[in-house]
Amino acid sequence: MRTEAQVPALQPPEPGLEGAMGHRTLVLPWVLLTLCVTAGTPEVWVQVRMEATELSSFTIRCGFLGSGSISLVTVSWGGPNGAGGTTLAVLHPERGIRQWAPARQARWETQSSISLILEGSGASSPCANTTFCCKFASFPEGSWEACGSLPPSSDPGLSAPPTPAPILRADLAGILGVSGVLLFGCVYLLHLLRRHKHRPAPRLQPSRTSPQAPRARAWAPSQASQAALHVPYATINTSCRPATLDTAHPHGGPSWWASLPTHAAHRPQGPAAWASTPIPARGSFVSVENGLYAQAGERPPHTGPGLTLFPDPRGPRAMEGPLGVR
């Protein structure tokens, strides 16, 4: 149905404050309801970190935020400016895990979380300007990808690595802002509906004015969006030594992160594949929904609820196809 078809249902406001308030009360819930419904659209997050404790090692984290079950995760990497890339690992929840050099260890951490460690030496190792991409497939809903790389300031010429605070603050500001607005909107919508409940509705059947139906309708999307936000990050840990540079990245100082969210326009509707498994809501973006503002800077957990893995018993190279090692 076209939007215009619904507009005449909203009566024009009567002159004066009463009419204006009535119009606002009618329009605002629809706006807020739209916000609540669209709040849970899938996102893929990628974070690239350089470890200070290990020589030129990378940690890449990527995560899927959505209500659909993950059917496949593909991790790839390549050079900048759209240069060709290579698949590092493919993780299938039922068929197992495949990885290729320089990937050393790939594993699931939670139902939407994986980790991948790369070898830190060799010509095939990534450099600071390497781009890492994570693609999450949720069959049959679709798939989503996000890519990330270290910020330019992480080049080895620097005497000391920058603090992670600016990067995190920028990322967190967006998360807090959007989540805050959506949360406030949903709460305010609920408030409006409750207020509407206590207001008398003359000459109308009680069954038709019962606030229960609209309330459930308005609140369900909000809960769905919260459920989507409560899915933790998927993580990919990678270590690397730049193949084209003789100098190593500096040791000292903290590690830093570059977060790159990508938004999708479609929301998976299917239930989570591991519905019975408790999901730890520990990511910084989750803390907004939980009200745990103190944990906003906390890093996502490295361990998940202990999902069973099905790696190939013959080792990571056992099932290589005719294309060979990439």
Epitope: G82, T87, V90, H92, A137, G324
Partner: nanobody, 127 residues
Framework: EVQLVESGGGLVQPGGSLRLSCAAS????????MSWVRQAPGKGLEWVST????????SYVDSVKGRFTISRDNTKNTLYLQMNSLKPEDTAVYYC????????????????????WGQGTQVTVSS
């Protein structure tokens, strides 16, 4: 959101040719291996061909070797399948998918075994 859109299917006589195209969007196309799979009427999903991320390596199922050619244009984010000397047994819905099915074996293939998939394009070879 990732999208793969196939085109180029149709009705062709035995011995004829078709060129399938798959337009990719929403992901870094040049980073991923791509494949063509097909599903004949009443049968399961069958792997046809795979090409690696830079186009340097290709592989084919035995039944199409010498007749089909897979290629890609990373500047256009497009995957191709040139099908020559078509046979009635090539009749199927052809799907463009991201990934190499050899990663987990070719048995009991399903579209959910791939990182992305298209809606498919019908190829009918009949006189």
């Amino acid at each position: 959101e990732v999208q793969l859109v196939e085109s180029g299917g149709g009705l062709v006589q035995p011995g004829g040719s078709l060129r399938l195209s798959c337009a990719a969007s929403g992901f870094t196309f040049s980073y991923y291996d791509m494949s063509w799979v097909r599903q004949a009427p009443g049968k399961g999903l069958e792997w046809v061909s795979t090409i690696n991320s830079n186009g340097g390596r290709t592989s084919y199922v035995d039944s199409v070797k010498g007749r089909f050619t897979i290629s890609r244009d990373n500047t256009k984010n497009t995957l191709y399948l040139q099908m020559n000397s078509l046979k009635p047994e090539d009749t199927a819905v052809y799907y463009c998918v991201e990934g190499d099915p050899h990663n987990f074996g070719l048995e009991n293939l399903s579209l959910r075994d791939f990182g992305s998939w298209g809606q498919g394009t019908q190829v009918t070879v009949s006189s």
